[in-house]
């Protein structure tokens, strides 16, 4: 191997470089010194470094490492945060639409039920929003409360419109009768099943994305050990002590050092992989009654069907309720007659067809594809970080921590490192407490994701059929069916096709393609910066 070049006779270059790190030159020797007090950059001969300089280099190395780690996770963090924000907003828009559709149904078909119905519908959808964001609300209670509130209004406004004000204290009795007599048939149960399934999945999906952000933040802000700081200092700065300012660390050596520094973090890898695969399973199952977009936007139809069910059984119901709630009523009033034209006019309630290709489900799948390109993120982290720091190409004429070498040899470097501190010891320390905590959280969310992953086949549909409902023949390739049973069924082409409101948010005109070339393909970047369309505009 070549002898090291003679050290800078005046330490001039080292002085000028060090001044950029630490204004003032009091720590820098004017000429090379023996350096017997050095603990990290152990000199083979005279050196331009002092103990104080070494300490400054160690601090700088650790700060560098923090920024490199943040750089390595930059795109992954952007990907998850932006998608979490988009989905949260999109879910809120779906809830708003669902509320508006339901209110429109009441306004168009049962104007006498408004404004009370609007109030109950509003409360229901507020609870839906809160539930998605993690609030401790029971979905069955929400649905029961909606129907419990609606029935007295339906009874007094539609079934017994002549009821005097004095008889209006029967509300509590009517609320109770609603459940006892199953006045809405099995519709409340159908809605409970659909809403609870779809909202549970939506909620866990958002929770999982937020935990993904927390995982990256945890590793992003790790504080590195003193041992790691010393290894980094040797790799990045000890060459300067010999006046070798332009020399870069060997790539292989960088990988060894980073594996040592990142040993604890890499332990996340197994659980991170499982997280992405479990999330993929969840997303693959988010269709039909597990898709809140599909379920909530069809609620108006199912609620309408449930009111029709009450109307069809009005005669029988009025008699029974008359007896049941007699103590609250002075006398029995005749049931209202329902002309045929009171039933829903399908033409009136046409859902606007929005010309957007992208649905929430396609966006979810797109996110999973992008996340899968980061499935090896933690195991590849040492390599990522080395790719973000200056290293010598091809491992030729590079710094191996002790000297300038023509070619890097891992064995020699390891031996050299053992002279100062044990790399194996560094690896054996185990993960930091914060890393252990985040691993526990990942285990927990993975378990939740697995239990939430949808049953394959049509198991759930069968259960619904047994309750006396048609599950409908909505094949995967057909338009999605929205709504519960025959009469109220309205087909909405691909739901809202990812919601018109978000269109302006996504900078439609900023689509990649409005450029002088197609979206760039850059193989070097795709190993880490996977240039996915993190927040792709509507196509």
């Amino acid at each position: 191997q070549p002898p090291p070049p003679p050290p800078d006779a005046t330490c001039h270059q080292v002085r000028s470089f060090f001044q950029r790190l630490q204004p003032g030159l009091k720590w820098v020797p004017e000429t090379p010194v023996p350096g017997s007090d050095l603990q990290v950059c152990l000199p083979k001969g005279p050196t331009c470094c002092s103990r104080k300089m070494e300490e400054k280099y160690q601090l700088t190395a650790r700060l560098n490492m923090e920024q490199l780690l943040q750089s390595a996770s930059m795109e992954l963090k952007f990907l998850i945060i932006q998608n979490a924000a988009v989905f949260q907003e999109a879910f809120e828009i779906v809830v708003r639409h669902a509320k508006n559709y339901t209110n429109a149904m009441f306004k168009n078909n049962y104007p006498s039920l408004t404004p009370q119905a609007f109030e109950f519908v509003g409360e229901f959808f507020t609870d839906v929003s809160l539930y998605i964001l993690g609030s401790d609300i029971n979905v069955d209670d929400m649905v029961n409360e909606l129907f419990d509130s609606l029935f007295p209004v339906i009874y007094t406004q539609l079934m017994n419109p002549g009821l005097p004000d004095s008889a209006l204290d029967i509300n509590e009795c009517l609320r109770g009768a609603r459940r006892d007599l199953k006045v809405f048939g099995n519709f409340p149960k159908l809605i409970m099943t659909q809403v609870s399934k779809s909202l549970q999945v939506t909620r866990i999906f958002l929770q999982a994305l937020n935990l993904g952000i927390e995982v990256i933040n945890t590793t992003d802000h790790l504080k590195f050990s003193k041992d790691c700081g010393r290894m980094l200092t040797r790799m990045w700065y000890c060459s300067y002590c010999q006046g070798l300012m332009m020399v870069k660390p060997c790539g292989g050596y960088c990988n060894v050092v980073m594996q040592g520094c990142m040993a604890g973090v890499v332990e996340i890898d197994k659980y991170w992989r499982e997280y992405i695969l479990s999330l993929e399973e969840l997303v693959n199952g988010m269709y039909r009654i597990y898709d809140m977009e599909n379920v909530l936007l069809g609620l108006f139809s199912t609620i309408h069907d449930s009111i029709q069910y009450v109307q069809k059984n009005a005669g029988k119901l009025t008699t029974t309720i008359g007896k049941l709630c007699a103590h609250s009523q002075q006398r029995q009033y005749r049931s209202a007659y329902y002309p045929e034209d009171l039933f829903i006019d399908k033409k009136v309630l046409k859902v606007a067809h929005v010309e957007h290709e992208e649905t929430l489900s396609s966006r979810r799948r797109e996110l999973i594809q992008k996340l899968k390109s980061f499935i090896s993120f933690y195991s590849a982290l040492p390599g990522y970080i080395c790719s973000h720091s200056p290293v010598a190409e091809n491992d030729t004429l590079c710094w191996n921590g002790q000297e300038l070498v023509e070619r890097y040899s891992q064995k020699a470097a390891r031996n050299g490192m053992k002279n100062q501190f044990n790399l194996h010891e560094l690896k054996m320390k185990g993960p930091e407490p914060v890393v252990s905590q985040i691993i526990d959280k990942l285990k927990h969310i993975n378990q939740l994701l697995r239990t939430m992953s949808m049953p394959k086949g049509r198991v759930l549909d069968k259960n619904l059929d047994e309750e006396g409902f048609e599950s409908g023949d909505c094949g995967d390739d057909e338009d999605e069916c929205i709504g519960g049973s025959g009469d109220g069924m309205i087909k909405v082409k691909n739901q809202l096709r990812f919601l018109a409101e978000l269109a302006y948010d996504l900078d439609v005109d900023d689509a990649p393609g409005n450029s002088q070339q197609a979206t760039p393909k850059d193989n070097e970047i795709s190993t880490f910066h996977n240039l996915g369309n993190v927040h792709s505009p509507l196509k």
Epitope: F78, A84, Q88, I213, N217, H388, S389, L531, V534
Partner: antibody, heavy 120, light 107 residues
Framework: EVQLQQSGPELVKPGPSLKISCKAS????????MTWVKQSHGKNLEWIGL????????TYNQKFKGKATLTVDKSSSTAYMELLSLTSEDSAVYYC?????????????WGQGTSVTVSS | DIVMTQSQKFMSTSVGDRVSITCKAS??????VAWYQQKPGQSPKALIY???NRHTGVPDRFTGSGSGTDFTLTISNVQSEDLADYFC?????????FGGGTKLEIK
């Protein structure tokens, strides 16, 4: 149309702190990170840091850690930068700039800038 | 930190000419380079992202090229309104860093 409206010019004495604001409109505020940039002497641009409005997550240039604090108010779609321990070195024009929705866009829309002069 | 060097502080050109502004990175930044134009008294405006892709509304006389450490912004058929400072930015590594700027003057 995406717009970033920054607070007006500031002439302040050296001392504790100053907070400047950047109100966003025309896009979904929580979705795009907001970055802050310092321009001194009419030329030199320095990246201060960025914040994700969705969850308040921040990344700083080490040089500005302890000098700048980034925050957001989602309800008013406003990003803030507080400059601490002001000295004449902090005299500059400060820009907020939105990081594009599509990851590699970098900073695609900029505010008009807030001129800060620190002088005793 | 990655240093972005724009060696030409000033460039003089005439209307209709073609001019190339260069930016050199101190280490490989792949394609994560953007270009900004700043006219006197205004805030910077995004021109190019990811080395060679034009932002919305940017005239096609602006083109970007390069990879690794050497990047170029070319303005063909220079117009008088192109009088401005031009900055490059790398976002491969934190902290993101800008070049020192090149002032384009029209003769």
């Amino acid at each position: 149309e995406v717009q970033l409206q920054q607070s007006g010019p500031e002439l302040v004495k050296p001392g504790p702190s100053l907070k400047i604001s950047c109100k966003a409109s025309g896009y979904s505020f929580t979705v795009s990170p907001m970055t802050w940039v310092k321009q001194s002497h009419g030329k030199n641009l320095e990246w201060i840091g960025l914040i994700h409005p969705y969850n308040g997550d921040t990344t700083y240039n080490q040089k500005f850690k302890g000098k700048a604090t980034l925050t957001v108010d989602k309800s008013s779609s406003t990003a803030y930068m507080e400059l601490l321990s002001l000295t004449s070195e902090d005299s500059a024009v400060y820009y907020c700039a939105r990081w594009g929705n599509y990851y590699p866009y970098a900073m695609d829309y900029w505010g008009q800038g807030t001129s800060v002069t620190v002088s005793s | 930190d990655i240093v972005m060097t724009q060696s030409q502080k000033f460039m003089s050109t005439s209307v209709g000419d073609r001019v190339s502004i260069t930016c050199k990175a101190s280490q490989n930044v792949r394609s994560t380079v953007a270009w900004y134009q700043q006219k006197p008294g205004q805030s910077p405006k995004a021109l190019i992202y990811l080395t060679s892709n034009r932002h919305t509304g940017v005239p096609d006389r602006f083109t970007g090229s390069g990879s690794g450490t050497d990047f170029t912004l070319t303005i063909s058929n220079v117009q008088s309104e192109d009088l401005a400072d031009y900055f490059c930015l790398q976002h491969w590594n934190y902290p993101y860093t800008f070049g020192g700027g090149t002032k384009l003057e029209i003769k």
